[in-house]
Each structure stands twice: as structure tokens, then as C-alpha cells.
């Protein structure tokens, strides 16, 4: 039972990448508004997006307190330009999310080659430790600040007149690959959480080969 | 429970093709990464090869490279082995494998193995 | 490609018997070293992984060493159930591969 013509949402899911993490929800709103709360599950719950024509809301600044909490959402409906008015049982219809635990749940976003050397036949490749919102002291912390060692690279290294893919990963940023000499190789790196068992990979970085501006090359 | 089960295993002559299919269950192969490894009558294991079935990369040993092409199909749940140009040299148990993907794990899983059998 | 070069290639033992089997990589893999147990008509089943690091479900009468590029994987009391082919795999670099085996036969 709620309010005449307010429905309650539905499909409620979370979008969240590198921590950035935004709830979505159905219907479009026919005058309706919604407003969502999200709490820990021992928290109180806090209010975001009052009264919103949006079918989502960011709820990053939530969730980046504590990445490892689990969270609950759930949205409210109002009958647009009525948005004292209840339901039958005295509270606004609203929905409830599914549980979200960001530091288990959040997708890993695109990494980024930074850099690749060539020394010799070694090759030394660097991924960008990208920022995310998460804070400590007033400070962004990197992906590798968050996730420490179980964060993990996958380095797909492939010679440029060749299409079989060799691996190599690490808990850094960093490889240090052999290679031929005299060959070119190109470069795409992976994003893995090991111990999760769901969005454990992120998409794979952009290609670089050798021979393009990123790299460097220094014969020994 | 992790489950890998290879099929399509059996007799073939020599320069004909087969395909082995590796079903999954307890696990989605979009998230791991699925090798085929081979032991020959009373002999060792030999990797034949992996695929990162969310990318579709693969790579072969050099004993195989260019005859044998894996595949994946995520919604299936499944990894290929496809063996063109068989030789009697491919006769053997063939095995899929899970790789768990980790600086510390590897092959986990492994399946039950398919015979593939190369004779004229 | 990286040789893993597997010793003895048999060997015969006794219950109760310390049982060592030794693995040594032709260049350096870190700790990227993994020890199987294979039995006749079987798969074979992870038991160490990361040189040294039990995998769940395996007795702790299994362990395993590393001294550079050389592995070690040492059972403390060999049982019946134990007596199968070992092998070891190193997975540092691709293409991963395995020694030649070791087939612990009862004495």
C-alpha cells in the first residue's frame, strides 16, 4: 500500500568503479521525486538526492569512509510537489538495495600502460597508480594504496609480428620482462583481485607497442 | 564446487581434427584464466596452452603452434581445445585446467582428462 | 623456455620413510614454483604452491623449500596413499612448465 499514483522503485543496482559509486534505480518518475538513504548496517542512516527527478545518486563520499563496511541503500518515493504526504501505513513507499561491500564489489577500472623501457633485452613496464576518491589524512589515495598486495597485474607482452600473448604479473606497479633482441613487442595490462570471486578483472589497458611515443629505448 | 569436465575425446586418424571441450561449473571462466595440459602414454605432463576467456588471449607451445586453437564461450561456461592436423605424437590424455591467476597459485583445478587417441 | 629439471625420476621407499624430491629451474622464477601428486588413471592435484605454502586439504606431513633457482618438496612420513608420481611446474613465465617426474614406488 502506498500514496495514489507513487510507485516504489525497483531494479535498485550499484554502479561503482574504482570506488566511485553511484546507486541506479527504475521507474522514470511520473510526478513522483525520490530521495535515497544508505547506512552501514550497524549506522544510522543518512539521507542523499532529496527529492531528485534523477534515477540514480552518487553516493561516493558515503562509501569512500570505509571501502571495507558494507552498505545499504534504500529509495524513497513522494508524490511530486507533495512530498509530506505518506502511505497508508504512515512512511513513503521505498525500496531497499541489494547489500554492497565496495572494497569486495567495486569494478577494477581500465588501467593505463604509463611507461615502457627497453634495456638490453629487458623491458620495464609501469602502470599509472590511479587515483581514487577514497581519503586518508585529506589525501586521494591510489588504487595501490587501497588494495595493497592484492591487487595484482596481469601483463599480456606479445612480439608485434607474432599474436601469441606471454603473462607475466605482479603486486606492484611494475615488470621487468625479457625479451628478444631486435624485436618489437606490444603491451596491454589487466587489473586482478585474486582473492575475489566476482569482478575479479578490470578490462584491459589500452595497447602500447614499442616504437611509439611512450617507450624508451636504450641500447647496452 | 569446482567442477572441470573435459569431452570429445576418441580415435582419430592421422591429419584429422578433433575438438575437446572443457565445461566449467562453480565457477565463471570469465574471471580465471583456462589452460590444456597433455600427458602422453606413461609420460609426463606438457602444457599445451591457455586462454584468458575474458579477452579471448591465448598463447600455445611451440609443439602444437599453429594446429591447435583454444577458444572460450563465456556464456557456455566453456573452453575449447580445437587439434587440427593430428599426429600420432598427440596421442594422449588431455587435460583442462584453472588457473587461479595469482603471483602464488596457479593450475588449482584440474578436470578428469579425455583421451584423444591418433592411429591409422 | 625454462627447464625444470626433476630428481630422481623414481624412486622406492617404505611407510614411515622421509621421501625428498628435488626440482632445479635453469634460471631464476622467484617463488613461482608449484608441486602436483598424480595417481595411474587420475588428475594431478595441487599440493604446494608459492614453493613452500601448503594447499588446502594436504596433510602437513607435505612441505616444500626453495634455495635459489633449486626446489625441494619433502614428505616427513611417507603413507600409503602417498605412493604416486610427483611433479613440479613453474608458472614465472610463460610458457609454464613441468619437471619430468618422480614415481615413489613402495620398497
Known amino acids: 500500500s502506498g500514496t495514489t499514483n507513487t510507485v516504489a522503485a525497483y531494479n535498485l543496482t550499484w554502479k561503482s568503479t574504482n570506488f566511485k559509486t553511484i546507486l541506479e534505480w527504475e521507474p522514470k518518475p511520473v510526478n513522483q521525486v525520490y530521495t535515497v538513504q544508505i547506512s552501514t548496517k550497524s549506522g544510522d542512516w543518512k539521507s542523499k538526492c532529496f527529492y531528485t527527478t534523477d534515477t540514480e545518486c552518487d553516493l561516493t563520499d558515503e562509501i569512500v569512509k570505509d571501502v571495507k563496511q558494507t552498505y545499504l541503500a534504500r529509495v524513497f518515493s513522494y508524490p511530486a510537489g507533495n512530498v509530506e504526504s505518506t502511505g497508508s501505513a504512515g512512511e513513503p513507499l521505498y525500496e531497499n538495495s541489494p547489500e554492497f561491500t565496495p572494497y569486495l564489489e567495486t569494478n577494477l577500472g581500465q588501467p593505463t600502460i604509463q611507461s615502457f623501457e627497453q634495456v638490453g633485452t629487458k623491458v620495464n613496464v609501469t602502470v599509472e597508480d590511479e587515483r581514487t576518491l577514497v581519503r586518508r589524512n585529506n589525501t586521494f589515495l591510489s588504487l595501490r594504496d587501497v588494495f595493497g598486495k592484492d591487487l595484482i597485474y596481469t601483463l599480456y607482452y606479445w612480439k608485434s609480428s607474432s599474436s601469441g600473448k606471454k603473462t607475466a604479473k605482479t603486486n606492484t606497479n611494475e615488470f621487468l620482462i625479457d625479451v628478444d633482441k631486435g624485436e618489437n613487442y606490444c603491451f596491454s595490462v589487466q587489473a586482478v583481485i585474486p582473492s575475489r570471486t566476482v569482478n575479479r578483472k578490470s578490462t584491459d589497458s589500452p595497447v602500447e607497442c614499442m616504437g611509439q611515443e611512450k617507450g624508451e629505448f636504450r641500447e647496452i | 564446487e569446482v567442477q572441470l569436465v573435459e569431452s570429445g575425446g576418441g580415435l582419430v586418424q592421422p591429419g584429422g581434427s578433433l575438438r575437446l571441450s572443457c565445461a566449467a561449473s562453480g565457477f565463471a571462466i570469465a574471471n580465471y584464466w583456462i589452460h590444456w595440459v597433455r600427458q602422453a602414454p606413461g609420460k609426463g605432463l606438457e602444457w599445451v596452452g591457455y586462454?584468458?576467456?575474458?579477452?579471448?588471449?591465448?598463447y600455445y607451445a611451440d609443439s602444437v603452434k599453429g594446429r591447435f586453437t583454444i577458444s572460450a564461450d563465456t556464456s557456455k561456461n566453456t573452453a575449447y581445445l580445437q587439434m587440427n592436423s593430428l599426429r600420432a605424437e598427440d596421442t594422449a590424455v588431455y587435460y583442462c585446467?584453472?588457473?587461479?591467476?595469482?603471483?602464488?597459485?596457479?593450475?588449482?583445478?584440474w578436470g578428469q582428462g579425455t583421451l584423444v587417441t591418433v592411429s591409422s | 623456455d625454462i627447464q625444470m629439471t626433476q630428481s630422481p625420476s623414481s624412486l622406492s621407499a617404505s611407510v614411515g620413510d622421509r621421501v625428498t624430491i628435488t626440482c632445479r629451474a635453469s634460471?631464476?622464477?622467484?617463488?613461482?614454483v608449484a608441486w602436483y601428486q598424480q595417481k595411474p588413471g587420475k588428475a594431478p592435484k595441487l599440493l604446494i604452491y608459492?614453493?613452500?605454502f601448503l594447499y588446502s586439504g594436504v596433510p602437513s606431513r607435505f612441505s616444500g623449500s626453495r634455495s635459489g633457482t633449486d626446489f625441494t618438496l619433502t614428505i616427513s612420513s611417507l603413507q600409503p596413499e602417498d605412493f604416486a608420481t610427483y611433479y613440479c611446474?613453474?608458472?614465472?613465465?610463460?610458457?609454464?612448465?613441468f619437471g619430468q617426474g618422480t614415481k615413489v614406488e613402495i620398497k
Open positions: 611446474q613453474q608458472h614465472y613465465t610463460t610458457p609454464p612448465t
Open positions: 586462454i584468458d576467456p575474458y579477452n579471448g588471449y591465448t
Open positions: 634460471q631464476d622464477v622467484n617463488t613461482a
Open positions: 585446467a584453472r588457473d587461479y591467476g595469482s603471483l602464488e597459485v596457479s593450475l588449482d583445478y
Open positions: 608459492s614453493a613452500s
